[in-house]
Interface confidence: low
């Protein structure tokens, strides 16, 4: 009696159980009662990466340099490329397939976790006590100078975007 | 048509200096690297120095290094190569080629003709 | 600093097919690319990333890159293939070429 269902790694065709082509490998021609599943290796630049019936490989995901992609891991016969972004860019998606400047974190904003190939700048205000005067994807708040540590007195206040302005003390006689 | 044109070279003493210029034009220029590859006589390629598409990023071989600059203008559709303190071994046909993209370097696609630079007493 | 390897030369009857290879420590896990240079001309991009073709480059010229070497292979050579071939990768932000391989196509 012909089968219904066949064993892992192999497919239902013509009434039998043919064996499914291996990572890496596209199918040339079904099994038949006499004959094995005629797999062929895929060729440079293209890949299968599971156990499979497919009669064309596909081909590698290209990083195209003009979105700022670069090539992270090349691919093999059996695995996709992986493409990131370029210093200085982020993926504008999960699937990366192009990538944006990292955004700068403007005055008054200070760096709380610098970008990476997959994530943008997280930004944060400046706390009281701190600031930023630079629009920077890096820098994060500074603290206001401390004038009493120098032996001066806070001559203008300190804002989130400036620091504290400090100037000798006024000694009266 | 894609071109790029170099000039510049000529006939230089040993510690002299050189600017060699290459012309682009049927691209967008800003849009991509670009690069300074040189050709000894009866010799293989070898690479001088790349530059991105901004101009933010420089590269440069061994053999040159604190003796070259390259840079570009993008408003002129130009690079430039400034070659200070010249050797014997200098002496090449310099070629300008466009890279493949702005940032990752693929391979050179375009290449110019070429400009002669020889040094010698 | 990296090294690319190429044969000084390499010979093939026309309409044969000519592999020129090119070594180098982990080349497979980089990109190389392939340049015709004939006598008093420049070079002329005919394989990138391994194995594409630019646009008006004959489908004769393949390449391939695995391991430690990168392959053009130029099947059916015709006599106007006669040339000099330079691979190249990029290692470590620099440009490496490998030192060129004469093909010569007899008769």
């Known amino acids: 009696e012909p089968p219904t269902a066949c064993r892992e790694k192999q497919y239902l065709i013509n009434s039998q159980c043919c064996s499914l082509c291996q990572p890496g490998q596209k199918l040339v021609s079904d099994c038949t009662e006499f004959t094995e599943t005629e797999c062929l290796p895929c060729s440079e630049s293209e890949f299968l990466d599971t156990w499979n019936r497919e009669t064309r490989c596909h081909q590698h995901k290209y990083c195209d340099p003009n979105l700022g992609l670069r090539v992270q891991q090349k691919g093999t016969s059996e695995t996709d490329t992986i493409c990131t972004c370029e210093e200085g860019l982020h993926c504008m998606s999960e699937s990366c397939e192009s990538c944006v400047p990292h955004r700068s974190c403007l005055p008054g904003f200070g760096v709380k976790q610098i970008a990476t190939g997959v994530s943008d700048t997280i930004c944060e205000p400046c706390p009281v006590g701190f600031f930023s005067n630079v629009s920077s994807a890096f820098e994060k708040c500074r603290p206001w100078t401390s004038c009493e540590t120098k032996d001066l007195v806070v001559q203008q206040a300190g804002t989130n975007k400036t620091d504290v302005v400090c100037g000798p003390q006024d000694r009266q006689r | 048509e894609v071109q790029l044109v170099e000039s510049g070279g000529g006939l230089v003493q040993p510690g002299g200096s050189l600017r060699l210029s290459c012309a682009a034009s049927g691209f967008t220029f800003s849009s991509y690297a670009m690069s300074w590859v040189r050709q000894a006589p009866g010799r293989g390629l070898e690479w001088v120095s790349t530059i991105n598409n901004s101009g933010g990023g420089t590269y440069y071989a061994d053999s040159v290094k604190g003796r070259f600059t390259i840079s570009r203008d993008n408003s002129k559709n130009t690079l430039y190569l400034h070659m200070n303190s010249l050797r014997a071994e200098d002496t090449a046909v310099y070629y300008c080629a466009k890279e493949g993209g702005k940032y990752y370097y693929y391979a050179m696609d375009v290449w110019g003709q070429g400009t002669t630079v020889t040094v010698s007493s | 600093s990296y090294e690319l390897t190429q044969p000084p030369s390499v010979s093939v009857s026309p309409g044969q097919t000519a592999s020129i290879t090119c070594s180098g420590d982990k080349l497979g896990d980089k990109y190389a690319c392939w340049y015709q240079q004939k006598p008093g001309q420049s070079p002329v991009l005919v394989i990138y990333?391994?194995?594409r073709r630019p646009s008006g480059i004959p489908e004769r010229f393949s390449g391939s890159n695995s391991g430690n070497t990168a392959t053009l292979t130029i099947s059916g050579t015709q006599a106007m293939d006669e040339a000099d071939y330079y691979c190249q990768a990029w290692a470590s932000s620099t440009v490496v070429f490998g030192g060129g391989t004469k093909l010569t196509v007899l008769g």
């Open positions: 990333q391994d194995s």
